[in-house]
């Protein structure tokens, strides 16, 4: 089942998902100057059977001589400067993507591949979160999120990290500043279908974390 | 409580386009991707695509990649999907529907009849 | 793309019946959906994650199933409940519905 919404943002983290369920579903995005060939797939999926995942589908970028027309195809100019982020400064929690059965591995590039990858996640899906360089963590518990879904809903777990500048002075355990995730969704949120206290979504990926061997984005 | 209230019919000329609106009240609007979905007389339902009303990703049915684009204004809390080159096959009622998982509330539908 | 064939297209049906609509996906999904639809409104959210009934819906509705093939059942039909049905996939993009199963009066 897809995620119908996104990770939540942590100021100054970025994360990624060392390995891909099967389901996660990429766009298959080109970059500027070339566009999708005719007949050629929209998405790889992660799809396998109990012993092998595999990436189905290939992604083929080509030429495109009139102006390509293909919806987000590059980001908005707003959105240029984020989604610059690059790979994690440190390496990521020690997960072997060829050890979790039912997992996909980083798809390898193709030519001519959009600057970013869309992600569309399913539930269960595991993100890891770190903190962007120049800045360091204060860990309240572990620095992951899981897509869930309760009553129908999808959501994202809230990843217990807060992120400092280096040169911050560190707070006290019991003096941590609450997670700055804007339209969080507060506990009492979290009754079931159809009433006003549906699940929100936690807030909307922000560019800034965005990050995989490219630079990403997780629908 | 929340509610989703959606513009009123339309009669359009082949050619023409067309602009449907969504206002969203009783929950945060842009914490939840709004979907839309389209059904012709007397047929089924029919997914077109969503928005990300706080960063304008668009994520679309192929098949109506070239007709439909799906934008939101977060200041008035409205998403609107507006359809070109209007032919008498788009006559249809299109709905919008708050996402999150599955579609807990829709809108009452508008109405797009396209004739000369 | 996931299709979604509803059957029987059409079920006539008395007041007390029991009725059963099937839905066949062409892969395997994680989940069906089920809305409600009645003419000339939206439709209605009936049943999630395959067998969960949404908020304020009767328990004489019941979902089941799993991988490509999954049902509806209305175990006593009741005046409200002539409407038409559709089975909804979200597993993979594009999200589909069946085509509609109406059930009518006999």
């Known amino acids: 089942e897809l995620c119908d919404d996104d990770p939540p943002e942590i100021p100054h983290a970025t994360f990624k998902a060392m390995a891909y369920k099967e389901g996660t579903m990429l766009n298959c995005e080109c970059k500027r100057g070339f566009r999708r060939i005719k007949s050629g797939s929209l998405y790889m999926l992660c799809t396998g059977n109990s012993s092998h995942s595999s990436w189905d589908n290939q992604c083929q970028c080509t030429s495109s001589a009139t102006r390509n027309t293909t919806k987000q195809v590059t980001p908005q100019p707003e959105e240029q400067k984020e989604r610059k982020t690059t790979e994690m400064q440190s390496p990521m929690q020690p997960v072997d993507q060829a050890s979790l059965p039912g997992h996909c591995r980083e798809p390898p590039p193709w030519e001519n591949e959009a600057t970013e990858r869309i992600y569309h996640f399913v539930v269960g899906q595991m993100v890891y979160y770190q903190c962007v360089q120049g800045y360091r963590a204060l860990h309240r518990g572990p620095a992951e999120s899981v897509c869930k879904m309760t009553h129908g809903k999808t959501r994202w777990t809230q990843p217990q990290l807060i992120c400092t500048g280096e040169m911050e002075t560190s707070q006290f355990p019991g003096e941590e500043k609450p997670q700055a995730s804007p339209e969080g969704r507060p506990e009492s949120e979290t009754s079931c279908l159809v009433t006003t206290t549906d699940f929100q979504i936690q807030t909307e990926m922000a560019a800034t974390m965005e990050t995989s061997i490219f630079t990403t984005e997780y629908q | 409580q929340v509610q989703l209230v959606q513009s009123g019919a339309e009669v359009k000329k082949p050619g023409s386009s067309v602009k449907v609106s969504c206002k969203a009240s009783?929950?945060?609007?842009?914490?939840?991707?709004m979907h839309w979905v389209r059904q012709a007389p007397g047929q089924g339902l029919e997914w077109i695509g969503y928005?990300?009303?706080?960063?304008?990703?668009?994520e679309y049915n192929q098949k109506f990649k070239d007709k439909a684009t799906i934008t939101a204004d977060e200041s008035t809390n409205t998403a609107y999907m507006e359809l070109s080159s209007l032919r008498s096959e788009d006559t249809a009622v299109y709905y919008c529907a708050r996402g999150g998982g599955v579609f807990d509330y829709w809108g009452q539908g508008t109405l797009v009849t396209v004739s000369s | 793309d996931i299709q979604m064939t509803q059957s029987p297209s059409t079920l006539s049906a008395s007041v007390g019946d029991r009725v059963t609509i099937t839905c066949s996906a062409s892969?395997?999904?994680?989940?069906m959906h089920w809305y409600q639809q009645k003419p000339g409104k939206a439709p209605k959210l009936l049943i999630y994650?395959?067998?969960e009934l949404a908020s304020g819906v009767p328990a004489r509705f019941s979902g089941s199933g799993s991988g490509t093939e999954f049902t509806l059942t209305i175990s006593s039909l009741q005046p409200d409940d002539f409407a038409t049905y559709y089975c909804?996939?979200?597993?993979?993009?594009?999200?589909?519905f069946g085509q509609g199963t109406k059930v009518e009066v006999k």
């Open positions: 909804h996939q979200r597993s993979t993009y594009p999200l589909t």
């Open positions: 892969s395997s999904i994680s989940y």
């Open positions: 994650t395959t067998s």
């Open positions: 009783g929950y945060t609007f842009t914490s939840y991707r």
């Open positions: 928005i990300r009303p706080n960063r304008g990703y668009t």
